[in-house]
């Protein structure tokens, strides 16, 4: 039975050119995390893998940083980069579990971060 | 250049333990993550299980209970035991290097495969 | 474990005409997938990882592309040494998986 919930950043917003970490954490679980996904859509930005450390994506190299910890940091964002991300846990032997981001990028300096909320 | 070369007996009795080496020659094992996949006749190419650049392993959990990998980095090789085995482990066996990093799951440098009947 | 099932099972092209290879995974896989050629004899070589980024020397007539479920190899100008079984892979999650291979020969 998967008893795990996944807290994340929520809906959060930034500035074009700016930075931004997407972070999740999942609690509530003792199952063992193999390995975290980070998505866009269905684009892969990065693989945290438990035994072999980071994957990022060709392309998304060079403006996408791992960590903190298990979050990401990405960089030099454009007002394409507005949209839902995923962070996909691996787990044994509960499973997968998922946590939605949303992230808008603004024009302007009136960028301030959303409130966190859980996913079950 | 980067070779990798696997040996081992080409003929295993069923119930014995299956064992080959992968021998690993113009790099250094103490990077990248080392890979065993095996293909029985006929069949897809299955993923057997690895070994990381800092000795932790994975296996494939429909062989886990009958599979170890190993290395011996002074010799610059790793090694698969199979035990318990049977007709159905008839395959040929290859090893295979990963960078997880610039890669991910993708295998770049593979040895030329040896194969291995059970067979009493 | 992930499923992947590749169409068609065997493709036999004039030298010179394109040819296309579906791989379709039994979940969303992202962009983590790659391709293999397994020529007569020898062991997989690396074509495509990352869906559609060619590996190092591999020759611009070989291109990847799709996300999520579906994906597809193109050769844009078969050559006769592109004969051989082409396999798609997916690395999303452990354990990774192979497709069953398409065979592919020269007419």
């Known amino acids: 039975m998967m008893t795990g919930t996944i807290e994340t950043t929520g809906n959060i917003s930034a500035e074009k050119g700016g930075s931004i970490i997407l972070q999740c954490h999942l609690s509530s679980t003792t199952a063992q995390v193999t390995q975290v996904n980070w998505e866009q859509q269905d684009q892969l930005l990065a693989i945290c893998n438990a035994d072999l450390g980071w994957h990022i994506s060709p392309s998304f190299k060079d403006r996408v940083a791992p960590g903190p910890g298990l979050g990401l940091t990405l960089q030099s964002l454009t007002v394409n980069d507005t949209g839902e991300y995923f962070c996909i846990y691996h787990t044994y032997p509960d499973g997968t579990y998922t946590g939605r981001i949303f992230l808008e990028v603004l024009e302007s300096s009136v960028a301030e971060h959303g409130a966190r909320f859980q996913i079950p | 250049e980067v070779q990798l070369q696997e040996s081992g007996p080409g003929l295993v009795k069923p119930s014995e333990t299956l064992s080959l080496t992968c021998a690993v020659s113009?790099?250094?094992?103490?990077?990248?993550?080392w890979n065993w996949i095996r293909q029985p006749p006929g069949k897809k190419l299955e993923y057997i299980g690895y070994?990381?650049?800092?000795?932790?392993?994975y296996y494939n959990p429909s062989l886990k209970s009958r599979v170890t990998i190993s290395r011996d980095t002074s010799k610059n090789q790793f090694s698969l035991k199979l035990s318990s085995v049977t007709a159905a482990d008839t395959a040929v066996y290859y090893c295979a290097r990963g960078d997880y990093s610039n890669y991910g799951g993708a295998m770049y440098d593979w040895g030329q495969g040896t194969t291995v009947t059970v067979s009493s | 474990d992930i499923v992947m099932t590749q169409t068609p099972l065997s493709l036999s092209v004039t030298p010179g005409q394109p040819a296309s290879i579906s791989c379709r995974a039994s979940?969303?896989?992202?962009?983590?997938i790659a391709w293999y050629l397994q020529k007569p004899g020898q062991s997989p070589q690396l074509l495509i990882y990352?869906?559609?980024y060619r590996y190092t020397g591999v020759p611009d007539r070989f291109s990847g592309s799709g996300s999520g479920t579906d994906f597809t190899l193109k050769i844009s100008r078969v050559e006769a040494e592109d004969v051989g079984v082409y396999y798609c892979q997916q690395y999303y999650s452990s354990p990774f998986t192979f497709g069953g291979g398409t065979k592919v020969e020269i007419k």
């Open positions: 113009g790099y250094s094992m103490t990077s990248d993550y």
């Open positions: 990352s869906a559609s």
């Open positions: 070994i990381s650049y800092s000795g932790r392993t």
């Open positions: 979940q969303g896989v992202s962009t983590t």
